[in-house]
Amino acid sequence: SGTTNTVAAYNLTWKSTNFKTILEWEPKPVNQVYTVQISTKSGDWKSKCFYTTDTECDLTDEIVKDVKQTYLARVFSYPAGNVESTGSAGEPLYENSPEFTPYLETNLGQPTIQSFEQVGTKVNVTVEDERTLVRRNNTFLSLRDVFGKDLIYTLYYWKSSSSGKKTAKTNTNEFLIDVDKGENYCFSVQAVIPSRTVNRKSTDSPVECMGQEKGEFRE
C-alpha cells in the first residue's frame, strides 16, 4: 500500500566509525523525497534531513548525546511535489532501521602511531588518542575518554630484516617493548574492545618503521 509512485525505503544501514554516524538506505529517489526520524527506546522522535533527495542522513549530533543509549531510526517517503500526502493508512510510508547502540557498535577507526622513541634496548610506542565528536562540558572527548579501560591496543612489531611478528597489548595508549640493540623494527597497531560481540577490532594502522620520521633514538 502507499501513495502513487512512492516506495518505502529499504536496506536501512547504520555506518558508524568513532561515533561519526550516518544512516544509509535505498532506493535512489525518483519523484520522491525522504525525512528521517531518530529516537531512543524511551524518547520522542526527532526529525532530521527534512525532505531530502539524499539516501543518507548524518545522525551524529543525536547519538553523541548519549552513546550508551539504543537508537532506532525510521525513514519516511513522500511524493516530491506533495509532501503532505499520506499513504492509504493515513500516514506517510516509512521503514524502521535496525536498533543501534553506538558504544557497542560504532566501528573503531584505523589508529595512528603518533611516535616511537628508543632508549637503549627499549622502545616506547605511542598511539594517537583520536578525538571523537562526543562532547561533555563543551569539550570533545577522545576515544580513550569515552571507552576508558574497555579499549585496548595491540601492537604488532617485527625486525625490518625478518617477517616474524611479536605482539604486545596495553589498556593505555603506550607500549614499552624490549628490542635487540642495533636492529630496526617496524610497528603497526590495532584498536580492540575485547568485551564487544561485534566490531571488536579496528583495521591495522599504517606501518611505521625505525629509521623514519616519527622515531627518535637515544643511547
Partner: antibody, heavy 120, light 111 residues
C-alpha cells in the same frame, strides 16, 4: 539541574550494617559512573569505590569485601553497604559523579555528604 | 600500594601572588594524564577544578591551571584571591582496573 545527594547517615553501633543511598537527578547512570568517597573528621579524602556506567564495580584494596556498591534498587540510585562497622568507619560519606563514566577519578558533581558516626 | 604525595601543608600565598602545589605518583597514572585536582573548603564537599591533568572544569576561573604527565603533576593558582584559601587534593586513576587514589591534601593559607 544535575545533582547527587546522599541519604541520611546517623549514629551506628560497632558490627552494625550501614546502607547509604545516592540519588541522582538530571543525568543517566547508564552514561555516568558514581563513586563513593569518605572523609574522617579532620582527615583527607579516601576513595572507597566506583560503579561505572556499565554497572561494573571497583573498590579500594582496603574496602574490598566489607563494602558493596550497587544500583539494583532503582534507576536513579546507587547504594553503598558497609558490613561490620567499626569506629574507624566514622566519617562523612560523599557520593560523586564520574565525569567520564568509568573509574577515571574525575568527579565533577558531589553530594553535600552525610555524617556516619560509629560508637558503642 | 598506590600513593600520591602532595606538597606539605600549609602553603602560604599572598593575595595577587602565585602558588604551586605538586603531586607525585608512585607509578604512572592511567594513560599518563588521568589526574584531577579538587578544592575543598571546611564543611563543604570537594569541587573539581582540573581533570585529565590540564583541562579546566566547567565554571572554574582560568587562574587555576594544571600541568604534568606520567608521575609528576602541578596545580598552579595565579593572581591568588582570599577565596582560594582551602585544601587542595589531587586524585588519579591507574592502569590497574581497580585503583583510584587521592593525595593527602595541601592546605593553602592566603595572607
Amino acid at each position: 539541574k544535575q545533582s547527587v545527594e546522599e541519604s541520611e547517615g546517623g549514629l551506628f553501633k560497632p558490627t552494625d550494617t550501614l546502607t547509604l543511598t545516592c540519588t541522582v537527578s538530571g543525568f543517566s547512570l547508564s552514561y555516568y559512573g558514581v563513586s563513593w568517597v569518605r572523609q574522617a573528621p579532620g582527615n583527607g579524602l579516601e576513595w572507597i569505590g566506583t560503579i561505572d556506567s556499565s554497572g561494573r564495580t571497583y573498590y579500594a584494596s582496603w574496602a574490598n569485601g566489607r563494602f558493596t556498591i550497587s544500583n539494583d534498587n532503582a534507576p536513579n540510585t546507587v547504594s553503598l553497604q558497609v558490613n561490620s562497622l567499626a569506629a574507624a568507619d566514622t566519617a562523612t560519606y560523599f557520593c560523586a559523579r564520574d565525569f567520564y563514566g568509568w573509574n577515571s577519578g574525575a568527579l565533577d558533581i558531589w553530594g553535600p555528604g552525610t555524617l556516619v558516626t560509629v560508637s558503642s | 600500594e598506590l600513593d600520591l604525595t602532595q606538597t606539605a601543608s600549609p602553603v602560604s600565598a599572598a593575595v595577587g601572588g602565585t602558588v604551586t602545589i605538586n603531586c607525585q605518583a608512585s607509578q604512572s597514572v592511567y594513560s599518563n594524564k588521568y589526574l584531577s585536582w579538587y578544592q575543598q573548603k571546611p564543611g563543604q564537599p570537594p569541587k573539581l577544578l582540573i581533570y585529565k591533568a590540564s583541562t579546566l572544569a566547567s565554571g572554574v576561573p582560568s587562574r587555576f591551571s594544571g600541568s604534568g604527565f606520567g608521575t609528576e603533576f602541578t596545580l598552579t593558582i595565579s593572581d591568588v584571591q582570599c577565596d582560594d584559601a582551602a585544601t587542595y587534593y589531587c586524585a588519579a586513576a591507574y592502569s590497574d582496573d581497580s585503583d583510584t587514589a587521592f593525595g593527602g591534601g595541601t592546605k593553602v593559607v592566603v595572607e
